[in-house]
Amino acid sequence: MMTGTIETTGNISAEKGGSIILQCHLSSTTAQVTQVNWEQQDQLLAICNADLGWHISPSFKDRVAPGPGLGLTLQSLTVNDTGEYFCIYHTYPDGTYTGRIFLEVLESSVAEHGARFQIP
């Protein structure tokens, strides 16, 4: 049975040209994390694999940095970066856990961080 929960940074906003950290945290399970995929809609941004390390998709290499931890840092944000982001935790023996983050990139300097929330 899958007992874990994913905590994410939830709904967040950031300024155009700035950077943002996407963070997820898997808790309430002893399952071993074998790989974390970071995806934007249907595009793979990056993977962090326990046996291989980080792989950043070539189209995002200039604007995506690994970390902190299993998180992902998006840099040089544009309005086109607005949208849903998913952290997909591949674990053994539980299986897959998915967390969702919604990022809004604002033209103005009014960018407030949303509260944390949990996805079971």
Partner: antibody, heavy 119, light 107 residues
Framework: EVQLVESGGGVVQPGRSLRLSCAAS????????MHWVRQAPGKGLEWVAV????????LYADSVKGRFTISRDNSKNTLYLQMNSLRAEDTALYYC????????????WGQGTMVTVSS | DIQLTQSPSSVSASVGDRVTITCRAS??????LAWYQQKPGKAPKLLIY???SLQSGVPSRFSGSGSGTDFTLTISSLQPEDFATYYC?????????FGGGTKVEIK
């Protein structure tokens, strides 16, 4: 004894293809990520490709992407490297290698198979 | 991709000498660094992984240290069988990359 034995190397003309094989024994082949690493004559080591234990994912060095394909047959304990559109700069000794789990380091290497691309 | 710069590219030493080889990464790689020894006509042999963990069966005269961008392989007392080429390898990012090698020669 844990062992990797490569085969399939040889002399080939530019633009042609070659398929390398790596026969594994002495360990549970299907549980491991497997890598190809090459070494040009008199040069250093270059990582080429990796394949997931179940073959579900593969990643390549930019220098071979779109030309080389890594694959595996876990029922035969064999790793493959299909090399297409070969270039002179692909001339090298090709090693398959097995990692120490979670260490991201390669502890078992084959003896290598030599690929020479020349007209 | 991460570049690894090894220095020196070659070193002449005598049996019993202490030899130090450095490896510098172009970006931080935490402790995801391995060291290999290669002799002519042979496959590389893993010495150190995780920057400082000694691989099983490797003599204790080999040691590794460092984290972030700067790493060191030390051979405390060089033995005749240690004359070889040594490579570092990073595994924080794919593609994994290797240093250019350091050849340890007999003085």
């Amino acid at each position: 004894e844990v062992q990797l034995v490569e085969s399939g190397g040889g002399v080939v003309q530019p633009g042609r293809s070659l398929r390398l094989s790596c026969a594994a024994s002495g360990f549970t082949f299907g549980s491991y990520y497997m890598h190809w690493v090459r070494q040009a004559p008199g040069k250093g080591l270059e990582w080429v490709a990796v394949i997931w234990p179940d073959g579900s994912n593969k990643l390549y060095a930019d220098s071979v992407k779109g030309r080389f394909t890594i694959s595996r047959d876990n029922s035969k304990n064999t790793l493959y490297l299909q090399m297409n559109s070969l270039r002179a700069e692909d001339t090298a000794l090709y090693y398959c290698a097995k990692p120490v789990p979670k260490s991201r380091a390669l502890d078992v290497w084959g003896q290598g198979t030599m690929v020479t691309v020349s007209s | 991709d991460i570049q690894l710069t090894q220095s020196p590219s070659s070193v002449s030493a005598s049996v019993g000498d202490r030899v130090t080889i450095t490896c510098r990464a172009s970006q931080g790689i935490s402790s995801w660094l391995a060291w290999y020894q290669q002799k002519p006509g042979k496959a590389p042999k893993l010495l150190i992984y995780g920057a400082s963990s000694l691989q099983s069966g490797v003599p204790s005269r080999f040691s590794g240290s460092g984290s972030g961008t700067d790493f060191t392989l030390t051979i405390s007392s060089l033995q005749p069988e240690d004359f070889a080429t040594y490579y570092c390898q990073q595994a924080f990012y794919l593609p994994w990359t290797f240093g250019g090698g350091t050849k340890v020669e007999i003085k």
